[in-house]
Interface confidence: low
């Protein structure tokens, strides 16, 4: 049995007057079903006179009645062609057709802009059967229209593999202007021209644009959207926005800040990360960038010693990572360090100067006049040397390091001795007989170990030999060390 659907008790009174065949708009339909995926129930209809012919697709029935009269062509009745309404309002529209009852398996589907509307749309199809014909009304409702609902809607019906298409119903949703392009924040050079763009659309069209700078309108006459504002140049920061007007009212874009590029602020918090004898690692916090990216930074270094000539060393580096290792500095020296950074406009002032010191350096000169003796009676080697001349920045002498290497057939062994700073002689035990002992000495400060002296060799004979003369480094300017035995 056919049951009445819950959706509606009566058809919508969408048509002026009765349908052909005495079907009144207040008749209750036998069946009213929500449209889903194009499916409709198959019903037997009985024919009656069709409505006005349709300008779109029609289906010419090839079947004849009992009296052999040809059936008239099928077509959707004309309905409203263009609906204009405001955003968020509700709308209902429909298409209708009268179908002879000889046709089975009729389906009506809704299409928008060439695509079938499936799923969760409020589409309802109502059937009004008569003896010979069934009037079908397909209604489509939108409870709160949005701009995306704008478009051309049609009904399609398939009968016996024939497709019947209704006239389009154009839905035009009107509302306040909608921005498709808003001005963007910019950082600009002082007194240099730049452009801002604003574009908004309806419907309704046209959309007119007013520009606003710091709360005051720039143009007295509106420009049609899209609008490009050419600002000849600014001397100080300004905020711009645009107003879009149409018949429904006005919409205001976001306000965008146009900043004037300036030289950066000086870096802050310059600090010492690490110091060695000849380098200092510094870091800094960049100042405000003046609305233009930092390009590079300059580290300025001057000796803090009042007796220095006041010359400034300059080291250039990239702006990131706010770290720089200053190299080639003197040991045990005081320096003033400042940092300046630049953007496309120019250099910042120098940061507050900070004081930094390098640590002691290692000695730069080896001990002089190294002499080596063999003391056979005590089975020792005596070593003597002269303290090297030290520079102040090499730091305080804390001692000496002695390297002695023992070499005989198949054996080579290096030993190291540490000697206090006051001595200028040392005694080491003979490690191997019938071997060569090679001695080198280096001075040591807190800054490290200096260079080793030239090697001095002495032969240590097997037990029982006599006559041992000293070995020594040559006087300055002489050739290689001489071994005297």
């Amino acid at each position: 049995a056919i049951t009445e659907a819950r959706e509606e008790a009566k058809p919508y009174p969408l048509f002026p007057g009765p349908f052909p065949g005495s079907l009144q708009t207040d008749h209750t339909p036998l069946l009213s079903l929500p449209h889903a995926s194009g499916y409709q129930p198959a019903l037997m209809f009985s024919p009656t006179q069709p409505g006005r012919p349709h300008t779109g697709n029609v289906a010419i029935p090839q079947v004849t009645s009992v009296e052999s009269k040809p059936l008239p062509p099928l077509a959707f009745k004309h309905t409203v062609g263009h609906i204009i309404l405001s955003e968020h309002k509700g709308v209902k529209f429909n298409c209708s057709i009268s179908v002879p009852n000889i046709y089975q398996d009729t389906t009506i589907s809704w299409w928008k802009d060439g695509k079938e509307l499936l799923g969760a749309h409020h589409a309802i199809t109502q059937f009004y059967p008569d003896d010979e014909v069934t009037a079908i009304i397909a209604s489509f409702s939108i409870t709160s229209v949005q701009r995306s609902d704008n478009g051309s809607y049609i009904c399609k019906m398939k009968i016996n593999n024939e497709e019947i298409v209704s006239d389009p119903i154009y839905i035009e949703v009107q509302g306040l202007p909608h921005f498709t392009k808003q001005p963007e924040s910019m950082n600009v050079t002082r007194n240099t021209a730049f452009n801002l763009t604003c574009q908004a659309v309806g419907p309704p069209e046209p959309v007119n644009i007013f520009w606003v700078q710091n709360s005051s309108r720039v143009n007295e006459q509106p420009e049609k959207s899209p609008s490009v504002l050419t600002v000849p140049g600014l001397t100080e920061m300004a905020v711009f926005s645009c107003e879009a007007h149409n018949d429904k009212g006005l919409t205001v874009s976001k306000g965008v800040q146009i900043n004037i590029k300036a030289i950066p602020s000086p870096p802050t918090e310059v600090s010492i990360r690490n110091s060695t004898a000849h380098s200092i690692l510094i870091s800094w916090v960049p100042g405000f960038d003046g609305y233009s990216p930092f390009r590079n930074c300059s580290i300025q270094v001057k000796e803090a010693d009042p007796l220095s000539n006041g010359s400034v060393m300059i080291f250039n580096t990239s702006a990131l990572p706010h770290l720089y290792q200053i190299k080639q500095l003197q040991a045990l020296a005081n320096y003033s360090i400042g940092v300046s950074c630049m953007n496309e406009i120019g250099w910042s002032a120098v940061s507050p100067w900070i004081l930094a010191s390098t640590t002691e350096g290692a000695p730069s000169v080896a001990p002089l006049n190294v002499t080596v003796f063999l003391n056979e009676s005590s089975d020792n080697v005596d070593i003597r040397w002269m303290k090297p001349p030290t520079k102040q920045q090499d730091g305080e002498l804390v001692g000496y390091r002695i390297s002695h290497v023992w070499q005989s057939a198949g054996i080579s062994k290096e030993l190291l001795e540490e000697v206090g700073q006051n001595g200028s002689r040392a005694r080491i035990s003979v490690q191997v007989h019938n071997a060569t002992c090679t001695v080198r000495i280096a001075a040591v400060t807190r800054g490290g170990v200096g260079p080793f002296s030239d090697p001095v060799k002495i032969f240590i004979p097997a037990h029982g030999w006599v006559d041992y003369a000293p070995s020594s480094t040559p006087a300055p300017g002489n050739a290689d060390p001489v071994l005297i035995i």
Epitope: S185, Q257, N259, T268, E269, S271, R273, S283, V285, P286, G287, F288, D289, Y291, L320, H322, L323
Partner: antibody, heavy 121, light 107 residues
Amino acid sequence: QVQLQQPGAELVKPGASVKLSCKASGYTFTSYWMHWVKQRPGQGLEWIGMIHPNINTNYNEKFKSKATLTVDISSSTAYMQLSSLTSEDSAVYYCAKRSPYSNYDWYFDVWGTGTTVTVSS
Amino acid sequence: DIQMTQSPASLSVSVGETVTITCRASENIYSNLAWYQQKQGKSPQLLVYAATNLADGVPSRFSGSGSGTQYSLKINSLQSEDFGSYYCQHFWGTPLTFGAGTKLELK
């Protein structure tokens, strides 16, 4: 004096979203980074991310799909939208400000009052 | 990401005592460290920035020290208003991370 005002509390259902606000006053809003920090009940502090009205945003990778930071320059207000909320998101959320344009100077001398977000059905 | 390991997790002390809280970074953060105090139900407050600098209005009994990866906050002669939680935070690049906190309780 510099102030960051935040609503006291928000009660939201699991799966929903919430948009927290932080209204700044007493300083030039467009010159400073605004940071957001999360603190779960009885727990420590977690940095969510930061936004500069004139520059851009920088998120903690952990919160990239959870938080969206925006600003409204006209009202000097920063916003953080939290999406797909679960009980793990129940926490106090603070906004906090520090100095402008300083890559390595992001400590916070001014904190908001904090908004307590409770996620419960 | 840089991990900040704070210790101890809690500390029971009396007024007048001196306490030291430490914070260890998983890598060198070059003194880019801040300390905060947070009282129950309140927002955190900055105490120390750049490892050693006292923030405006912070009493001189607070002091920060350290470099590299090891940092500490010292509170001399603890006052009753000093009880609460303390957090360290590095700002050597993003993401910024905080220590888990140290809760200072009255013995």
